[in-house]
């Protein structure tokens, strides 16, 4: 039986009806591996999800997201909505960044601006909610007898933007 | 003897988990899926999911997808079910059945009764 | 989701007669279907899978017909042992497999 069993290719199943022979997985199932008993479930893109692989009788299907939502999980297992830059997913949802904080993409949490003093330097551009601090040389590299064509802005942390 | 062996019943506060386990004997674990199905006092079966032992694969029962979660422990021969945030709607006989073929149930454990309650 | 309908919810039947059990489904699930008996205290058992294939070990007095939406289970003779409760259950397609609300079969 085992062996009898362990014919059965992928796309079938060992029919235990009909003396272990091999049957074709039944619509909507799928089976990647040889010498299954039972072939599986195919996924179901529905919902938010939408699909991007049909199913097979030997692979299953495989889905994407809706636009205006992204995949999280393995094989995307789950759709998250999708925020504008400068915001984040929350329980009441989408959420402009806190002033210090930015966010340069439509998923993800807002992070604060980087200190540019930790690393000696200077900001050179103002973070923003969208957009991390651009820091620029230290201050001690701005003497006079340097050469900058445009004076850097003042040195602010961690990097002001009005808002 | 080809059977499946369910853990013993269990009492269990409002807004705990539990999990409850079936061991499977006299056959190839991996060969074949291990189904969940509910059973209130009094009442119909209600199909939860299934677990594919061989490649970990499950397919559940909409209503129940937030609130089993379903395992397998290979060398062991044993599938789990954990129910999470258990209320009294949850009290009720558990068990776990097996599919050849196509998916009905041709081998059943004798079930686990959950009872929630404060 | 497919709904299974059993009818009737309890059958009164003296021992040795025929009991003829109905179930219909919501829309056609093929030949993709089971019938169960359980007993009070114990686990549900298969009978009939296919429709009317008898699982192994089920005694012949039991039998099951229909195709689509419309399905029968026959006990030709009761026993004293097959007074129980009786589920059919579908498999057909996509799941939630969904059960009848089963025919409790009670000895008149």
């Known amino acids: 039986l085992q062996d009898l069993c362990s014919n059965c290719p992928a796309g079938t199943f060992c029919d235990n009806n009909r003396s272990q022979i091999c049957s074709p997985c039944p619509p909507n199932s799928f089976s990647s591996a040889g010498g299954q008993r039972t072939c599986d479930i195919c996924r179901q893109c529905k919902g938010v999800f939408k699909t991007r692989k049909e199913c097979s009788s030997t692979s299953n299907a495989e889905c994407d997201c809706i636009s205006g939502y992204h995949c999280l999980g393995a094989e995307c297992s789950m759709c998250e909505q999708d925020c504008k830059q400068g915001q984040e997913l929350t329980k009441k949802g989408c959420k402009d960044c806190c002033f210090g904080t930015f966010n340069d993409q439509k998923r993800g949490i807002c992070r604060p601006w980087t200190n540019c003093s930790l690393d000696g330097k200077s900001v050179l551009v103002n973070g923003t909610k969208e957009r991390d601090v651009v820091c620029g040389p230290s201050p001690a590299d701005l003497s006079p007898g340097a050469s900058s064509a445009t004076p850097p802005a003042p040195a602010r942390e961690p990097g002001h933007s009005p808002q | 003897q080809v059977q499946l062996q369910q853990s013993e019943a269990e009492l269990v506060r409002p807004g705990a988990s539990v999990k409850i386990s079936c061991k499977a004997f006299?056959?190839?674990?991996?060969?074949?899926?291990i189904n969940w199905v509910k059973q209130r006092p009094g009442q119909g079966l209600d199909w939860i999911g299934y677990i594919n032992p061989y490649n970990d694969y499950t397919t559940f029962n909409r209503k129940f997808k937030d609130k089993a979660t379903l395992t397998v422990h290979k060398s062991s021969s044993t599938a789990y079910m954990e129910l999470s945030g258990l209320t009294s709607d949850d009290s009720a006989v558990y068990y776990c059945?097996?599919?050849?073929?196509?998916?009905?149930?041709?081998?059943w454990g004798r079930g686990t009764v959950v009872t929630v309650s404060s | 989701e497919i709904v299974m309908t059993q009818s009737p919810a309890t059958l009164s039947v003296s021992p040795g007669e025929r009991a003829t059990l109905s179930c219909r489904a919501s829309q056609s699930v093929s030949s993709n279907l089971a019938w169960y008996q359980q007993k009070p205290g114990q686990a549900p058992r298969l009978l009939i899978y296919?429709?009317?294939t008898r699982a192994t070990g089920i005694p012949a007095r039991f039998s099951g017909s229909g195709s689509g939406t419309d399905f029968t289970l026959t006990i030709s003779s009761l026993q004293s042992e097959d007074f129980a409760v009786y589920y059919c259950?579908?498999?057909?397609?996509?799941?939630?497999?969904?059960f009848g609300q089963g025919t409790k079969v009670e000895i008149k």
């Open positions: 006299g056959y190839t674990f991996t060969n074949h899926h």
């Open positions: 259950q579908q498999y057909n397609n996509w799941p939630p497999w969904t």
């Open positions: 059945a097996r599919t050849w073929g196509h998916w009905y149930f041709d081998l």
């Open positions: 296919d429709s009317s």
